[in-house]
C-alpha cells in the first residue's frame, strides 16, 4: 500500500515574453519559433511514493521518454542536481551503480527507467515535502532533468490503491494537428520575420543557473493540455536534508568510480565532472527574472498522480567524455 505524490496544477510561466521582446507584435512569431524548434523534445518523468509499511521509506521512479541512448542517470534530492541538490545515486548503463545513504537500493527497472528506494531516520530521513530529481544524460539529446515530491499532507496510512498515471502518447489526430500547426506556424513565422526584419532582435537573458549561454526557447503550450510541463522547483524543508552522505555503496565497486569526486554527494557535479573533454552547450530555456521555464514537447503533457515532467533548466549537454562515448 503506497501513497503517491500528487502533482500540483501545472501553470504556464506568468511573465510574458513581451517584456523581453519589447514589441507585442513579435510575441506570436517567437512562440511559433519555439514550436518549430522544440517539437520532439524528450521528456523525463518522476514518480515518488511513500511505502505505507515503512513510514520513512520512499520509492522514487524516473524514466526517460526520448530517442537517445542513455549514458548516465543521477538521482538527487533537495533540488536539481548541480543547483543545490544532493546526490543520492548515480547509475551508469554498464559500469554499475553508486549510491549514498539514505539510498538503500538503486536499480535499472527497465532499459529507460530506474528506481531508488530511500530509507532512514533522523537527519538522513526524507520527509514528505522533499523534492527528488532525476537527470538523464543521453546521446545525442543531452541532459534532461525532472523533479517530483510527495506533498506534506500525504498520509501513508491511506488504503486507496495507487492511481495509475496516464499514458503519455500522441494519437494520430494529435500528430496531424501538431504537424499542421507547426507547418503553418513556421511559414507564418518566416512571413512575419521578413516583415519585421528592420526591427532589432530581442535579447534573451540566459539562465544564471548555467555557466553556458543556452539557445533560447520559449515555453510552448501543448494542444492536448492548457497546463505547462513546468512547476518551479519546490523549496524544501532543509531540516529534511541529510547531515552527511559520505557513505558510498558501490555495486561491486567498479573501477570507473575511482574518478568520482570525493564529495560528490555534497557538491553534485553531474556527468560533466568525469568528462575528459569540454562539454558543448546546447540550451533549451528562456530565463525571465531567472525563472526556470520548461518548454512543452511533442507529446501531450498528461501528467498524473505521482508524475512530474519537465526538462533540465540548464539545457541539454552532450556527454563527450569517457562516460558518454561507448
Amino acid at each position: 500500500m503506497r501513497t503517491e505524490a500528487q502533482v500540483p496544477a501545472l501553470q504556464p510561466p506568468e511573465p510574458g515574453l513581451e517584456g523581453a521582446m519589447g514589441h507585442r507584435t513579435l510575441v506570436l512569431p517567437w512562440v511559433l519559433l519555439t514550436l518549430c524548434v522544440t517539437a520532439g523534445t524528450p521528456e523525463v518523468w518522476v514518480q515518488v511514493r511513500m511505502e505505507a509499511t515503512e513510514l520513512s521509506s520512499f520509492t522514487i521512479r524516473c524514466g526517460f521518454l526520448g530517442s537517445g541512448s542513455i549514458s548516465l542517470v543521477t538521482v538527487s534530492w533537495g533540488g536539481p542536481n548541480g543547483a543545490g541538490g544532493t546526490t543520492l545515486a548515480v547509475l551508469h548503463p554498464e559500469r554499475g551503480i553508486r549510491q549514498w545513504a539514505p539510498a538503500r537500493q538503486a536499480r535499472w527497472e527497465t532499459q529507460s527507467s530506474i528506481s531508488l528506494i530511500l530509507e532512514g531516520s533522523g537527519a538522513s530521513s526524507p520527509c514528505a515535502n522533499t523534492t527528488f530529481c532525476c537527470k538523464f544524460a543521453s546521446f545525442p539529446e543531452g541532459s534532461w532533468e525532472a523533479c517530483g515530491s510527495l506533498p506534506p499532507s500525504s498520509d501513508p496510512g491511506l488504503s486507496a490503491p495507487p492511481t495509475p498515471a496516464p499514458i503519455l502518447r500522441a494519437d494520430l489526430a494529435g500528430i496531424l494537428g501538431v504537424s499542421g500547426v507547426l507547418l503553418f506556424g513556421c511559414v507564418y513565422l518566416l512571413h512575419l520575420l521578413r516583415r519585421h526584419k528592420h526591427r532589432p532582435a530581442p535579447r534573451l537573458q540566459p539562465s544564471r543557473t548555467s555557466p553556458q549561454a543556452p539557445r533560447a526557447r520559449a515555453w510552448a503550450p501543448s494542444q492536448a493540455s492548457q497546463a505547462a510541463l513546468h512547476v518551479p522547483y519546490a523549496t524544501i524543508n532543509t531540516s529534511c536534508r541529510p547531515a552527511t552522505l559520505d557513505t558510498a555503496h558501490p555495486h561491486g565497486g567498479p573501477s570507473w568510480w575511482a574518478s568520482l569526486p570525493t564529495h560528490a554527494a555534497h557538491r553534485p557535479q553531474g556527468p560533466a565532472a568525469w568528462a575528459s573533454t569540454p562539454i558543448p552547450a546546447r540550451g533549451s530555456f528562456v530565463s525571465v527574472e531567472n525563472g526556470l521555464y520548461a518548454q512543452a514537447g511533442e507529446r501531450p503533457p498528461h501528467t498524473g498522480p505521482g508524475l512530474t515532467l519537465f526538462p533540465d533548466p540548464r539545457g541539454p549537454r552532450a556527454m563527450e567524455g569517457p562516460l558518454g562515448v561507448r
Epitope: L65, G96, R107, I167
Partner: antibody, heavy 123, light 106 residues
Framework: QVQLVQSGAEVKKPGSSVKVSCKAS????????ISWVRQAPGQGLEWMGN????????NYAQKFQGRVTITADESTSTAYMELSSLRSEDTAVYYC????????????????WGQGTLVTVSS | DIQMTQSPSSLSASVGDRVTITCRAS??????LNWYQQKPGKAPKLLIY???SLQSGVPSRFSGSGSGTDFTLTISSLQPEDFATYYC????????FGGGTKVEIK
Amino acid sequence: QVQLVQSGAEVKKPGSSVKVSCKASGGTFSSAAISWVRQAPGQGLEWMGNIIPIVGIANYAQKFQGRVTITADESTSTAYMELSSLRSEDTAVYYCARDTGRGYTRHFWFDPWGQGTLVTVSS
Amino acid sequence: DIQMTQSPSSLSASVGDRVTITCRASQSISSYLNWYQQKPGKAPKLLIYAASSLQSGVPSRFSGSGSGTDFTLTISSLQPEDFATYYCQQSDILYTFGGGTKVEIK
C-alpha cells in the same frame, strides 16, 4: 517464475479494433515493463511498445504510434494491447513479453513470453 | 530508429556443422544486443543477452560476440533441435529486431 498467459484468438473486420490481454502470474508484475511484439505470417518480429504497470507510462514504436494503446491493470496483473483501425496487414500473432534485466546495468531482454494471440483481420 | 540487419536470411547446414549468423546495427549499440531462437508455432526463446551472456538453461554450444555495430551468434556444433529461426534484437534505444535467419537442414 513469471508466466504470461494471453487471451484467445480473434477475428476482426477491417477498420475495427482489437484488444489483447496478457495476464502475469508467479512473480512481480508492477515494476517490470511488459512489451508487445507482433509477427505476421512468415515474417519477422516487430516490437510495438511497452508499459511499466506501476507507473502507467507506455512507450511506442514509431510505426504504431497513434494506432496502438498499451495499458495495464495492477490489481489483476494484466497488460492490454489495443490496436485500432485494423487492416489486413495487421493479421499476425501478437505476443506479450516481460522486459527482464539484472538491475545493475541497463541491459534488458524479453523473457518470458506469452503463448501468442492470433488476430485475423478479414472482411 | 535503429535498424538491425541479419545475414544470411537463411542457410542450410548439417548436424555437427559450425554455424555463424551475423547481425549489424545501423548505429553503435554498445553491447545492447540479444539473440532469440524461434520454432514454428512457438514463442521466441532467449538464447544470449548483452551480446555474449548465455541465458541459463541454454546449451553452451551457443555463443555470442561483438560490440558496437557488428555481432555474431555462433553454434559450435549444430544439433537436430537447433533447426529454427534466429533473431537478433537491440535494446539500446527502445527495441528493434533483425529480420531473422532461418537455419534449415541441408
